[in-house]
């Protein structure tokens, strides 16, 4: 059979009816719905919202919807025994703490279970001792710190600004520099925006909110304690010492008015230049220590939370293919939140929530896809990514046989300015095209195309006329899918200016002040944005799913190989007498990417003009597209990072929500110049050559004629 | 008691090299950066450089990059300026001095050299 | 880099009076500017670092306020001991730090 005649609707009145069923005012009865009371992972109250999902999801047309439960390792505060921070004097008593919760916003008073503001994951302790202020902890300020400056963090208690990196890096880049404890602030530099009022008045970060997150360096593996295979009924589980990427020392989070108390008395070294000052009037001193009149009084904290094994619960929904049932396409967004979850992640679970009613609205009217669509409604994002690595490590040989395509859907918004996209190069034509499809919801733009309002106000910084559309890192739930398994990913949102807004994510991020409230009032009163978002994610979605041939396109891959390959020749260019000493080249991996893009092209043709209407070539043509994505996996995985197995992209090994392309060159290269053995430092970039010139050639041959 | 005792005067001829030192007691001379001064005659300080004694790291202003070397001797606490080839305009006080911190004011001073140059 | 201003070149105040000098930066550097009194024939001294905080053993008619581009030293009641060369300096930049061309302060 056609896709026409296994769906009864022409392709072209199949995506209108879909994208006109979506509906704005649905999506705000949902966000209202699901942003009432908190669903914190492991507890009751998100157990029964899955159970609410699955329920809506079924009357909503889905063939089938399940619960997956799996018990993962998450981390609560000791309810009686609160985490807080203290200024101590020499006699050891506290003459300062900071706050042990956030003031509720107006209307949520009497709410219970609002679990105060903790790093998840950290160790119990009560270590005191100096502080030393750390800029935003990332790489290059430890540098700065320790190598440069001389300033010793060994022993010290750090703190240090969130923003710029995942809290995750910070920690361990402490740990690394042998810091006793972490102490992570918002810095009004970086969550308070110019000129716009602090919640409830306005959707800044107010003195007392903190962000709340997990700390763990997971490296994809998912649960602690069951890396590689899923937490079900008969896992073996790791002892809490072999436990995978669990920080090792005390680490808590505080709001800014908090930090203003600590910074306020730092002595010490003046901050290296004016890149560490934040916008407290304080003087960002780094220390160590206080200064002369405070000198004896040192920092201690007290962390109590506790590790537990709990029962964690996703969503899975299947509409079935008509034509091709063993072909998924996946849309995925977590359900858990920290508190509300007014933007993180209910804002987009209920743009998934809408997408999935329209999808059973065509279905109870006779339509199907041509392929099966998949919905999940992940837990336990927010621990570590662990619902959906758990889901996908259960699933993985499916998966990998059959997975065509994965679009997350987490927070819809995190501003209200113009599209943001993050993708595989397969599917930079889908979301071009798609977007010249649907209208701009953005004031001056009237009339206009998503596409040309996107354009204008984010444009590529390569080719003219053309929206950026970044890498995919990572720190959502696309991680396992892209990463680990090679499924060809992308996700879409609404974002801010990023050239006039410095701050990192939205300010409320992760703070009981992510309300239903903060998006009703501020960021997207009518909703249009989170439709339009709907209509991005929808829609790729329902092309994946119900094209005749696949909508991804391999000539864009090779461009940005070339691109890619470009960059990392010339950082290691940076070093010409080593490359030249030992005898380091490039050429295997140009020679590469040169085949790759002319198969990429002679497949193209060939795909332009084969007979569509033989199943078997088809399905045959597809299915080289699908694996494509798949080519680029290498089973041995990066160095030290087993389930990051994707040769051209992997998370960064300094900030985990950053892409870096080449991430094994790139990695065998970074700092270099300091490494004991430069023979073996530069063994290991040949190595990682290697490795990359090998998977593109390889992945080139999955393109080429099969006979 | 924290001091810095320079070395004693020089007089010296254009094209002719120079090694001065700065020696530091009642500290802990490795772990506080040296920095050097010059004032020329009747005029204002210039930073000229600093010197980490712990591990001989050493920052140059831009003005004074190639023109001198600041080295350390950490078993002898002891820090130099030296010149391969000075100048009649070198003439001036030299002054080490202890930055109190990495990123910091300088809190001890060394009494000065005198270096004068003239053929 | 930053330049330092410092003004008033000369400054005269006779004793007991008060001496205001002032320094101003082409950046802002926070808080990070020190104070130092020279007197003819010897080395610098700190007086004020962090813009405001005394060194042990400075008398306390010495003060220092500003921050940003803005800084003043202020000696409150002048003693003849206080005749001097006063510059300031930022350690904003590091490893870069630069001074002021200097403020000469004369007792009538």
């Known amino acids: 059979k056609s896709s026409n005649e296994a769906t009864n609707i022409t392709p072209k009145h199949n995506m209108k009816a879909f994208l006109d069923e979506l509906k704005a005012e649905n999506i705000k009865k949902f966000l209202y719905n699901f942003t009432q009371i908190p669903h914190l992972a492991g507890t009751e109250q998100n157990f029964q919202l899955a159970k609410q999902i699955q329920s809506q999801w079924k009357e909503f047309g889905l063939d089938s919807v399940e619960l997956a439960h799996y018990d993962v390792l998450l981390s609560y505060p000791n309810k009686t025994h609160p985490n807080y921070i203290s200024i101590i004097n020499e006699d050891g008593n506290e003459i300062f703490n900071t706050s042990l919760f956030e003031p509720p916003p107006p209307g949520y008073e009497n709410v219970s279970d609002i679990v105060p503001p903790f790093s998840a994951f950290s160790p119990q302790g009560m270590p005191e001792g100096d502080l030393v202020y750390v800029n935003y902890a990332r790489t290059e300020d430890f540098f700065k710190l320790e190598r440069d400056m001389k300033i010793n963090c060994s022993g010290k208690i750090v703190i240090a600004r969130y923003g710029k990196v995942f809290r995750g890096n910070k920690v361990k880049n402490a740990q690394l520099a042998g810091a006793k404890g972490v102490i992570l602030y918002s810095d009004p530099a970086d969550y308070f925006a110019p000129g716009v009022k602090s919640y409830p008045d306005g959707w800044n970060l107010p003195g007392g909110g903190v962000q709340r997150g997990n700390i763990l360096n997971l490296n994809g593996a998912g649960d602690p304690l069951t890396p590689g295979y899923p937490a079900n009924e008969y896992a073996y589980r790791r002892g809490i010492a072999e436990a995978v990427g669990l920080p090792s020392i005390p680490v808590h989070p505080i709001g800014y008015y908090d930090a203003q108390k600590l910074l306020e008395k730092m002595g010490g070294s003046a901050p290296p230049d004016s890149s560490w000052r934040g916008s407290l009037k304080v003087p960002y001193n780094v220390g160590p220590g206080f200064t002369g009149n405070f000198s004896t009084q040192k920092v201690k904290m007290h962390i109590h939370s506790t590790n537990e094994v709990t029962r964690i619960y996703n969503v899975i929904g299947t509409l079935r293919g008509a034509v091709e049932p063993d072909r998924y396409v996946i849309l995925g967004g977590h359900r858990d939140s920290w508190v509300f979850g007014g933007i993180d992640p209910q804002s987009g679970a209920a743009v998934v929530h809408e997408i999935v009613r329209s999808f059973g609205t065509l279905k109870k009217e006779g339509w199907r896809p041509r392929r099966t669509i998949l919905f999940a409604s992940w837990d336990a994002e927010e621990f570590g990514l662990l619902g959906s690595t758990e889901w996908a490590e259960e699933n993985s040989r499916l998966l990998q046989e059959r997975g065509v395509a994965y679009i997350n859907a987490d927070s819809s918004i995190e501003g209200n300015y113009t599209l943001r996209v993050d993708c595989t190069p397969l599917m930079y034509s889908l979301v071009h095209n798609l977007t010249k499809e649907l209208k701009s919801p953005d004031e001056g733009f009237e009339g206009k195309s998503l596409y040309e309002s996107w354009t204008k106000k984010s444009p590529s910084p390569e080719f003219s006329g053309m929206p950026r559309i970044s890498k995919l890192g990572s720190g959502n739930d696309f991680e396992v899918f892209f990463q680990r398994l090679g499924i060809a990913s992308g996700r879409a949102r609404y974002t801010k200016n990023w050239e006039t807004n410095k701050f990192s994510g939205y300010p409320l991020y992760h703070s009981v002040y992510e309300t239903y409230e903060l998006v009703e009032k501020f960021y997207d009163p009518m909703f249009k944005y989170h439709l339009t978002v709907a209509q991005v994610r929808g829609g790729m979605v329902f092309e994946l799913a119900n094209s005749i041939v696949l909508p991804f396109d391999c000539r864009d891959y090779a461009v940005v190989l070339r691109k890619y390959a470009d960059k990392i020749y010339s950082i290691s260019m940076k070093h010409p007498q080593e490359m030249k000493t030992y005898s380091v080249s490039f050429d295997s991996l140009f020679s590469a990417v040169k085949n790759f893009t002319e198969i990429a092209s002679k497949f193209s043709e060939r795909l332009q003009d084969f007979d569509k209407s033989n199943p078997i070539v088809l399905r045959m043509m597809n299915d080289q597209l699908m694996f494509l994505e798949r080519a680029f996996i290498d089973p041995l995985g990066l160095p030290d990072r087993p389930f990051y197995r994707h040769v051209i992209y992997a998370p960064s090994s300094h900030n985990k929500y950053a892409g870096e392309s080449f991430p094994g060159i790139y990695d065998a290269l970074f700092d270099i110049e300091s490494k004991v053995d430069p023979s073996k430092a530069w063994g290991e970039v040949k190595r990682q050559i290697y490795v990359a010139a090998f998977t593109v050639q390889a992945a080139a041959e999955t393109l080429s004629e099969v006979a | 008691e924290v001091q810095l005792v320079q070395s004693g005067a020089e007089v010296k001829k254009p094209g002719e090299s120079l090694k001065i030192s700065c020696k530091g007691s009642?500290?802990?001379?490795?772990?506080?950066?040296i920095g050097w001064v010059r004032q020329m005659p009747g005029k204002g300080l210039e930073w000229m450089g600093i010197?980490?004694?712990?591990?001989?790291?050493?920052r140059y202003s831009p003005s004074f990059q190639g023109q001198v070397t600041i080295s350390a001797d950490k078993s002898i606490s002891t820090a130099y300026l030296q010149w391969s080839s000075l100048k009649a305009s070198d003439t001036a006080m030299y002054y080490c001095?202890?930055?109190?911190?990495?990123?910091?004011?300088?809190?001890?001073w060394g009494q000065g050299t005198l270096v004068t140059v003239s053929s | 880099g930053i330049v330092m201003t410092q003004s008033p070149a000369t400054l005269s105040v006779s004793p007991g009076e008060r001496a205001t000098l002032s320094c101003r930066t082409s950046q802002s550097i926070g808080w990070n500017l020190a104070w130092y009194q020279q007197k003819p024939g010897q080395a610098p001294r700190l007086l004020i670092y962090g813009a405001s905080s005394r060194t042990t053993g400075i008398p306390a008619r010495f003060s220092g306020s500003g921050s940003g581009t803005e800084f003043t030293l202020t000696i409150s009641s002048l003693q003849s001991e206080d005749s001097a060369v006063y510059y300031c300096q930022h350690y904003d930049n590091w490893p870069m730090c630069s001074f002021g061309q200097g403020t000469e302060l004369e007792i009538k």
């Open positions: 001095a202890r930055r109190m911190a990495a990123a910091g004011p300088f809190d001890y």
């Open positions: 010197i980490y004694p712990g591990d001989s790291d050493t």
């Open positions: 009642g500290y802990s001379f490795t772990s506080y950066w």
